[in-house]
């Protein structure tokens, strides 16, 4: 098995954890691609993704998480603005590829948000004051919800535009044979 | 159709090990997170664990922390939930349910039949 | 671990009435995504539970119109518009914010 490594981001309360995903440009330049926590006992779960295809440089906001696919660069950039305490955790980026395995992007990122200072909590460069000038995307091929052998009505996150899920089950395997190691700090 | 199919009734005696199956159909197998929920009767429901069936890693809940053991056999598409050194507590009806590790949601949009465990000397 | 606090336990119903379930989380349920990772299930008499509403809006699939889910943060609702006959059971929310679940202690609906 592959030796996965993390790395550290210590950030405070409404402060932007900003990191970039790289991937292979040819391969996977329109593959769609999605932000995962990984819970405890390797169980990855997908975030927020970008559309399928995806779009060059379309940035799409899902909630507190910007998510945007630089084909040109083979980077995925992903924003987590505000952050929380509750934030804190283990994330990863996958490019989905079906029929085959997600194929995961290294290395994990290890988010340790803390409580900030009494004072302005957004007041350092790489505070979440800019973020919210992105134009609200209306994508509406994001991941999907929920699935369900027969149709499901949703209503998107109250921070988003449009999310809605694809016409049908997107048929995947999980991460876990590919990152079942043990984590280092 | 989709559905979980578990194993029939069981009863033990204290200090003994149960051993539920929970048999999947009509869905990729491996697509998704297996949890097992127990109800004790006239009770609520509890959260005993999860599996990972692509690579069998699990996570349980710390009250059974080293009384359970939850396995797959993805050649049969079957998880297992085995509970060890029963007492009368443990009588209850066992169920499996199933959550996508893939979509937003963390829902258990299908549900096993149950499987009652009786603990009775 | 999170803990979930539902209202009433017992919830006496005239069909046709409208029925209104509270749940109550120690602490946020909101996601970075923007989403409450908040579901409710019925559970009918001697069977399966079922899920009803899940990302605490979002009914699921086969669910009448007469259910809805809403609130964030700590605080959720669990409302039918016009109780039914087969509406009775026990209903519960969960938290799936993050491990382990937690349920509520359930609701009780029967008919008066």
């Known amino acids: 098995a592959t030796k996965l490594t993390e790395e550290k981001y210590e950030l405070k309360e409404g402060q932007t954890l900003d990191v970039k995903c790289d991937y292979t440009l040819e391969k996977f330049a329109s593959s769609q691609k999605a932000w995962q926590i990984i819970r405890d006992g390797e169980m990855p779960k997908t975030l927020a993704c970008t559309e399928r295809p995806s779009k060059n440089s379309h940035p799409v906001q899902v909630g507190r998480i910007i998510l945007e696919d630089y084909h040109d660069h083979g980077l995925l950039r992903v924003r987590m603005v505000n952050l929380q305490v509750e934030d804190s955790g283990l994330y990863q980026c996958v490019i989905y590829q079906p029929p085959k395995e997600p194929h995961m992007l290294f290395d994990r990122i290890r988010l340790v948000v803390t409580k900030g200072f009494s004072g302005t909590p957004g007041s350092n460069e790489n505070s979440t004051q800019n973020v919210y000038k992105i134009p609200p995307t209306t994508t509406k091929a994001l991941c999907p919800l929920y699935t369900s052998p027969r149709t499901v009505t949703q209503a998107p996150p109250k921070s988003t535009a449009d999310v809605s899920t694809p016409d049908s089950e997107i048929n995947l395997t999980n991460v876990t044979d590919i990152i079942r190691v043990p984590v280092f700090n | 159709q989709v559905q979980l199919v578990q194993s029939g009734a069981e009863v033990k005696k204290p200090g003994a090990s149960v051993k539920v199956s929970c048999k999947a159909s009509?869905?990729?197998?491996?697509?998704?997170?297996i949890h097992w929920v127990r109800q004790a009767p006239g009770q609520g429901l509890e959260w005993m664990g999860i599996i990972n069936p692509s690579g069998g890693s699990t996570s349980y809940a710390q009250k059974f922390q080293g009384r359970v053991t939850m396995t797959r056999d993805t050649s049969t598409s079957t998880v297992y939930m085995e509970l060890s050194s029963l007492r009368s507590e443990d009588t209850a009806v066992y169920y499996c349910?199933?959550?996508?590790?893939?979509?937003?949601?963390?829902?258990?949009?299908?549900w096993g039949q149950g499987t009652m465990v009786t603990v009775s000397s | 671990d999170i803990v979930m606090t539902q209202s009433p336990l017992s919830l006496p119903v005239t069909p046709g009435e409208p029925a209104s379930i509270s749940c109550r989380s120690s602490?946020?349920?909101?996601?970075?995504?923007?989403?409450?990772?908040l579901d409710w299930y019925l559970q009918k008499p001697g069977q399966s539970p079922q899920l009803l509403i899940y990302l605490g809006s979002n009914r699921a699939s086969g669910v009448p119109d007469r259910f809805s889910g809403s609130g964030s943060g700590t605080d959720f609702t669990l409302k039918i518009s016009r109780v039914e006959a087969e509406d009775v059971g026990v209903y519960y929310c969960?938290?799936?914010?993050?491990?382990?679940?937690?349920f509520g202690g359930g609701t009780k609906v029967e008919i008066k």
């Open positions: 009509g869905y990729t197998f491996t697509s998704y997170y």
């Open positions: 969960m938290q799936a914010r993050q491990l382990p679940w937690t």
């Open positions: 602490q946020s349920l909101l996601h970075s995504n923007g989403y409450n990772y």
């Open positions: 349910a199933r959550e996508s590790g893939y979509h937003v949601s963390t829902a258990f949009d299908i």
